[in-house]
Structures are given as C-alpha cells and as structure tokens.
C-alpha cells in the first residue's frame, strides 16, 4: 500500500509536518504532540511582556 501525503499544501499553507493527522506539530519543541497539549498563551497582566503563543501546524486531509 502506497502511503499518501500527510497533508495537502495550499499555495500559502505552511509546509507539511511529520505528524499523522491525529497529532499536531509543536513549533516550540519541534515535535508532534497531542493537539490538546498545545495551548495559546494565557492573557498577560497589564504591562507585562510574554513570549509569543505556542502554535501548531496541523495536517488536513
């Protein structure tokens, strides 16, 4: 059985990730994790600075 592509890449879509569709790619640690482990940053207190939110690339079929 030939393996199909992990994701379909649109013109402006991010590059395909090595994750199966059941997982998401964590850009922070650079590996696949359960998508529920990816959280956007909590709202920051007024005047405080914080790192960019954690994001993921998720393949779609």
């Amino acid at each position: 059985m030939r393996r199909g592509p992990r994701s379909l890449r649109g013109r402006d879509a991010p590059a395909p990730t090595p994750c199966v569709p059941a997982e998401c790619f964590d850009l922070l640690v650079r590996h696949c994790v359960a998508c529920g482990l990816l959280r956007t940053a909590r709202p920051k207190p007024a005047g405080a600075s914080s790192p960019a939110p954690r994001t993921a690339l998720q393949p779609q079929e």
Partner: antibody, heavy 118, light 113 residues
Framework: EVKLVESGGGLVQPGGSLRLSCAIS????????MSWVRQPPGKALEWLGF??????????EYNPSVKGRFTISRDNSQSIFYLQMNTLRAEDSATYYC?????????WGQGTTVTVSA | DIVMSQSPSSLAVSVGEKVTMSCKSS????????????LAWYQQKPGQSPKLLIY???TRESGVPDRFTGSGSGTDFTLTISSVKAEDLAVYYC?????????FGGGTKLEIK
C-alpha cells in the same frame, strides 16, 4: 491490504514478564505510528501507548497506568513491533490489540490474550 | 485524564429503526486552531476486534456505510445509525485523542430485537 497479527500471549504468573509481538504487512512499517490497546474480559478498551514513526525518531507515549512497567519498541527490519510487559499483575489480564495510528486508531489486529494468574 | 461517558450502556432496537447514542467528555475535545474535535467512534462486533467508524467526530472512515453518522462538538457527541441492520449488532465505543492518555468510553451495546 493492511494486516496486523499479534502473538505472544499466554498464561503468566504474577510478577512475571511477557513480550507481545505485532507483525505488520500491507504498508511501510517505518512510516506509521503503532499503538497497543487492551481489553479485559467483558470490559472497555484501554489505550496503553504508541510509538511514532521514523520521521519522529520512534518516540513513545504511554498511559501513566502502565508507564515504567510496559515498553513499546519496534524492529523495522522485520516489520514487527513489541510490547514488553514486566511485573505483571492479575489486573493486566486482557486481550491485547495492536493498532495503526493515523487519523485515530485506524486498523486493529485480531488480538492476543494474556492471563496473569498463579 | 479525560473521562469519556457513554449512554445508554445498552439498547435494543428493531431492524430499520433509527438509533442514537451519546458520548460526553469531561473536557472539550475541540482544538480551536483547526476546528477539529479529536473524537473517534469504533464498532466492536462479538468476538472481533474494534473497527474505526468515525474520526474527527464526524468524518466517516472509508468503507463505512453512510447510515453511520457522527455529530457534536466540544464535550457532547452523538453516533447515529439511520436505519439499523442486523449486522450492526455490536458494542460502540467513543475515544478521545485530544490529549494523553487517550481514553475510551465504557461502550454502548446495541442489541437487535
């Protein structure tokens, strides 16, 4: 056609060890995550963990309920992956299934039965 | 761990009837970045291994009859069989794969009258 065949089940005494095998055919073994799931007699399913594919360095995830006692590994040259079970308990008695992970647990083997009893 | 609760635990219906079964999760399974719900449904016929029916809560697996429909979002999900056939006799399990450990519901046993 995807085919998964488990083996290695049987009767083992409490405290003993057992290694289950899952023989894979019909797809490129290095390209897929593989998982183990168990089902005690007459009960629901319990996910034990999985091993990722080559692109992800064959990293693993485990259910905390078995982490430290169970180890998932793979022999890609023979298209087999394994579940090593140590310090077995009566509550580990179940049918053990291997499954291919892609969109969810996509394909399952027929299962192998493990009985832990003195 | 996310707790998956299924209801009813069993039901008996006649061939041709419509069936709905429920699955509730203890936390949302919706990943907002892609709007996918990480919820799957499996069918386990007597003496057989489970078979994937539905993934992402509502996407039917290839080869699964269109009488099986998954719906819902967040924490409340439903599997509907539009017109039950005798061959649908099975236990149906929902499972979340939103986070580790993946967890299953206790199952709904479908019996045919």
């Amino acid at each position: 056609e995807v085919k998964l065949v488990e083996s290695g089940g049987g009767l083992v005494q409490p405290g003993g060890s057992l290694r289950l095998s899952c023989a894979i055919s019909g797809f490129t073994v290095t390209a897929y995550y593989m998982s183990w799931v168990r089902q005690p007699p007459g009960k629901a399913l319990e996910w034990l963990g999985f091993i990722r594919d080559k692109a992800n360095g064959y990293t693993t995830e485990y259910n905390p309920s078995v982490k430290g006692r169970f180890t998932i590994s793979r022999d890609n040259s023979q298209s087999i992956f394994y579940l090593q079970m140590n310090t077995l308990r009566a509550e580990d008695s179940a049918t053990y299934y291997c499954a291919q992970v892609r969109r969810a647990l996509d394909y399952w083997g027929q299962g192998t039965t493990v009985t832990v009893s003195a | 761990d996310i707790v998956m609760s299924q209801s009813p635990s069993s039901l008996a219906v006649s061939v041709g009837e419509k069936v709905t079964m429920s699955c509730k999760s203890s936390q949302s399974l919706l990943y907002s970045s892609n709007q996918n719900n990480y919820l799957a449904w499996y069918q386990q016929k007597p003496g057989q291994s489970p078979k994937l029916l539905i993934y992402w809560a509502s996407t039917r697996e290839s080869g699964v009859p269109d009488r099986f429909t998954g719906s819902g979002s967040g924490t409340d999900f439903t599997l509907t069989i539009s017109s039950v056939k005798a061959e649908d006799l099975a236990v149906y399990y929902c499972q979340q794969y939103y986070t580790y450990p993946y967890t299953f519901g206790g199952g709904t046993k479908l019996e045919i009258k």
